[in-house]
């Protein structure tokens, strides 16, 4: 696990570009950015959703362009855009940065958004490295930014896949301890003997296979009956409550030629070393002429039986012979009970009612963990939640100052004035009412409900 961080340094007209400002809009506006991360550099990445994650920046300061004034340094949102990633950092990725302008003028239906620029870059980047700088052009615009990927302890390494522990810590098998706050020396786990059980074995030296309590055998596949009931297979004993060992499909390692065995429901699967394949890795002496690569894999090398061949697998397949389909859903990327769909070219999450987001990470119903700012209250209902904002505030979280006059509430040319407790309409001659909705007859009498005593047409009307 870790975090991808993006820092926008500047956005403005590029060299030779139109000398216009990104703020050239009617009325006040502000900039913000959105980032999308996709794994891989292939063309297939273009078809996949933002599988590594996405983030939306804060809005920048409100800016009103001064006519005839040169474009100033552009006020940008503060802070980093951070995209947390849960699994390994892929090393190669596609980065999409959208630059948006939010126009705060008198649009009907609220502020509009305008997409100013969209840059897409394919990059290689190791986690834990320094900031990488970039300058990208999109039409007449130029975007300057830096980015990095960093692991979050206890994960370390260029892909955030190694677990970190102090060198002084005792060796504790596969469940490595996280680093102490000031001790971040890390060791790559040694490569164990081929076939050593990932679940029940571990190693301190390369090539060895040491077993956890309750397991024995050269590859730690055989359960020990005298153990204290750790991870044993078989029916429960009535006398001890412990599991009585039963035979497992990998017992005795049915995989030949150094293949490693892993259990599947009711069966087993052999992962074969290069140069061997078959159910039990029993087939050898294969060359590229024998067509050993399945599912459209490209065979390289292996011109004679003594030299190994390598299968370069197409996206979606893996294994020494490209025989295994990558089950990207096995990583359970969809949160909150979402249904994972591996479409081949892309991964999709179909979210349960009340959840949304590329990975169903947004809980639309949850008021419990939801804070509405500025005195707003969270309201659930209709399969969604929303903030009911206090007067003078708006937006999804009531963080935005709302202009009560933005919706043009005063009818028939009435003028709207913002007031600390709402709004006031100053009606045009001939109209009255809280929103100037009632025409006044020439005799001074309203055609609809009578005005309260002492209120003359044209007087400002307080709107509660």
């Amino acid at each position: 696990a870790g975090v991808f961080e993006l820092q926008i340094h500047s956005f403005g007209p590029g060299p030779g570009g139109a000398p216009r400002s990104p703020y050239s809009a009617r009325g006040p506006c502000r900039l913000f950015f959105r980032v999308c991360l996709k794994p891989g550099l292939s063309e297939e990445a273009a078809e996949s959703p933002c599988a590594l994650g996405a983030a939306l920046s804060a809005r920048g300061p409100v800016y009103t362009e001064q006519p005839e004034a040169p474009a100033p340094d552009l006020p940008l949102p503060n802070g980093l855009l951070q995209v947390p990633f849960r699994d390994a950092w892929p090393g190669t990725f596609s980065l999409i940065i959208e630059t948006w302008r939010e126009e705060l003028g008198d649009q009907i239906g609220g502020p509009a958004w305008s997409l100013l620029a969209r840059v897409t870059r394919r990059r290689r980047l190791a986690a834990g490295g320094p900031w990488a700088g970039d300058i990208q052009r999109a039409g007449a615009w130029e975007l300057r930014f830096s980015y990095r990927a960093r692991c979050e302890l206890p994960a370390v390494g260029t892909a955030c896949t190694r677990l970190c522990r102090p060198r002084s810590a005792s060796r504790c098998g596969p469940g490595l301890r996280p680093c102490a706050p000031l001790e971040d020396e890390c060791e790559a786990p040694p490569v164990c003997r081929a076939g050593c059980s990932l679940e029940h074995g571990f190693c301190e030296q390369p090539g060895e296979c040491r077993c956890l309590e309750g397991w024995t055998g050269p590859l730690c596949m055989v359960p020990v009956s005298t153990s204290s009931c750790l991870g044993l297979r078989g029916p429960s004993s009535t006398t001890t409550g412990c599991l009585v060992p039963g035979p497992g499909p990998c017992d005795g390692n049915p995989c030949a030629n150094g293949g490693s065995c892993s259990e599947t429901p009711g069966s087993f699967e052999c992962t074969c070393p290069r140069g061997f394949y078959g159910l039990r890795c029993e087939v050898s002496g294969v060359t590229c002429a024998d067509g050993p690569c399945f599912n459209g894999g490209l065979c390289v090398g292996g011109a004679d039986p003594d030299s190994a061949y390598i299968c370069h697998c197409p996206p979606g397949f893996q294994g020494s012979n490209c025989e295994k389909r990558v089950d990207r859903c096995s990583l359970q990327p969809c949160r909150n009970g979402g249904l994972c769909l591996d479409l081949g070219h892309a991964l999709r999450c179909r979210c349960r009612a009340g959840f949304a987001g590329p990975r169903c990470e947004h809980d639309l119903n949850d008021c419990a963990g939801r804070a509405c700012a500025n005195g707003g209250t969270c309201v659930e209902g209709g399969g969604a939640h929303r903030c009911s904002c206090a007067l003078g505030f708006g937006g999804r979280d009531c963080r935005e100052r709302a202009d009560p006059c933005a919706a043009r509430p005063c009818a028939h040319g009435g003028r709207c004035y913002a007031h600390f407790s709402g709004l006031v309409c100053a009606c045009a001659p001939g109209y009255m009412g809280a929103r100037c909705e009632f025409p006044v007859h020439p005799d001074g009498v309203s055609a609809l409900p009578a005005a309260p005593p002492g209120l003359r047409p044209g007087d400002p009307q307080r709107y509660p």
Epitope: C36, C50, A54, I96, E98, A112, G357, P358, L364
Partner: nanobody, 127 residues
Framework: EVDLVESGGGLVQPGGSLRLSCAAS????????MVWFRQAPGQEREFVGG????????AYTDSVKGRFTFSRDNAKNTGYLQMNSLRPDDTAVYYC????????????????????WGHGTQVTVSS
């Protein structure tokens, strides 16, 4: 499952207008961002604009601002693209797309983020 059908395309002279419709069948369209992309021959599919899922706000690409407007009629499960002051470089196949994501902010400008697509309608601007 949501099915999208575009209509309203055709041949128009420069400076003319067209109104495209995107009719959605299936689930309630109001829960979805409904947006328009366009694709000219030999070009990548380009975001034009549309309305967001969570509050219906309009989003535009800068090049069409002031000429194109986006609206939706949730009662009819239909989105609209009103195109005025058309130019020859607006010639393309226009596609309607919909998705529940993102749950906040403007709609995605990236085609791969949309689960549901129409088959497109041709717009040709030529004298």
């Amino acid at each position: 499952e949501v099915d999208l059908v575009e209509s309203g395309g055709g041949l128009v002279q420069p400076g003319g207008s067209l109104r495209l419709s995107c009719a959605a069948s299936g689930r309630t369209a109001s829960r979805y961002s409904m947006v328009w992309f366009r694709q000219a021959p030999g070009q990548e599919r380009e975001f034009v604009g549309g309305n967001s899922a969570h509050d219906g706000r309009s989003a535009y690409t800068d090049s069409v601002k002031g000429r194109f407007t986006f609206s939706r009629d949730n009662a009819k499960n239909t989105g609209y693209l009103q195109m005025n002051s058309l130019r020859p470089d607006d010639t393309a196949v226009y596609y309607c797309a919909a998705d529940t994501n993102p749950p906040y902010g403007p709609p995605w400008s990236t085609p791969s983020e949309y689960e549901y697509w129409g088959h497109g309608t041709q717009v040709t601007v030529s004298s």
